[in-house]
Amino acid sequence: LPSPEGATSCECEEGFFRAPQDPASMPCTRPPSAPHYLTAVGMGAKVELRWTPPQDSGGREDIVYSVTCEQCWPESGECGPCEASVRYSEPPHGLTRTSVTVSDLEPHMNYTFTVEARNGVSGLVTSRSFRTASVSINQTEPPKVRLEGRSTTSLSVSWSIPPPQQSRVWKYEVTYRKKGDSNSYNVRRTEGFSVTLDDLAPDTTYLVQVQALTQEGQGAGSKVHEFQTLSPEGSGNLAV
């Protein structure tokens, strides 16, 4: 005979769960499906990851996302985690938003990003709900910088990048400062592959760095080089 009253709580069917903190009156729920749609858009040394919520929320509203990163070396094909070397716009675990920016990616490296959706009962199953996206970083190579000539008050500097990448560069930014003076620096922009830095102090070391500017933003910066102007005794014009 049917019971005159309904049960105060019901066992969950297979594949459905109640989280420990769920009240007995709450319906049984299940883990979410994977994020529905994931894109990875590369911008220089950054990638913007965007995704849409799972089509099946599992009947819960407490969905959070975790992002993990793997990098692969193209020459060897070997791969490894890259959490230690990249920077996320916000902590990559327990995300409630559906986008994140990953920066400090290395040129010519292949990256695979995994976005996992979880809810309050995901910890009760061993399976994971995730989607992956891969991206190759094709940021311009750092310019190779040379000292072409110097005088007591100037330094002539040139640089090069591989010819296939030159068409992507619209300008080069040359930053320089006196060694030991980290409070002020000068910036010159040029479309060419060389510049003469004038009005410098004699017998003084300057720190010089060149960076390519591309449509996607800044390319990789060169090394910080140390170049020294001539002392008044050994002046000669633009000698190296």
Partner: antibody, heavy 130, light 108 residues
Amino acid sequence: QVQLQQWGAGLLKPSETLSLTCAVYGGSFSDYYWSWIRQPPGKGLEWIGEVNHRGSINYNNYNPSLKSRVTISVDASKNQFSLKLTSVTAADTAVYYCAKPLRPHCTNGVCYSGDAFDIWGQGTMVTVAS
Amino acid sequence: SYVLTQPPSVSVAPGQTARITCGGNNIGSKNVHWYQQKPGQAPVLVVYDDSDRPSGIPEQFSGSNSGNTATLTISRVEAGDEADYYCQVWDSSSDHLVFGGGTKLTVL
């Protein structure tokens, strides 16, 4: 081929002054910044400071954490440079190395601060204990 | 002050490739040098200027550097490569020399 030979007292009491000397054999003494580096037992390398002797002037640069206690000096006539560390404590117990950079500091206007060290002294174990 | 971060230990089987990382803010703009140190001995320079090898250092040692990570790669690892490895840079902001904390390479 440049060689470095170092010597100095190996056992000190707290508050005493550590004193080590490094002799440079071969190479151009005034072209390089000469460094001292130390390594406490079971720990990593720590740069102490460097000196360059050009003309009659010594150019010094010290690790900020040791600066108040360190002096690195030069005897250019003997191609030697020395380390003095005052008011030592047990925390200064370490192997001390002198080292030569790979390249002259500046060549034709191109300079190499903090260059790689291609030649090291044999190391001197200095123990500070009461 | 500038900080270089190395993993305390890396383990690898003989014949495999070991990668030792050295992390630092915008380290790609600096020249990174690597040393090998065996117990009771002074350090030995194995790679300078990110990827150049001094004479006498075998080709199995190579290096790379970009972004915030420099890497020392030791291919075809053998028992004799077991040692501590240190990275080093010059911090041009403070004009001081900095070493990483060191990585102990264990050959299994």
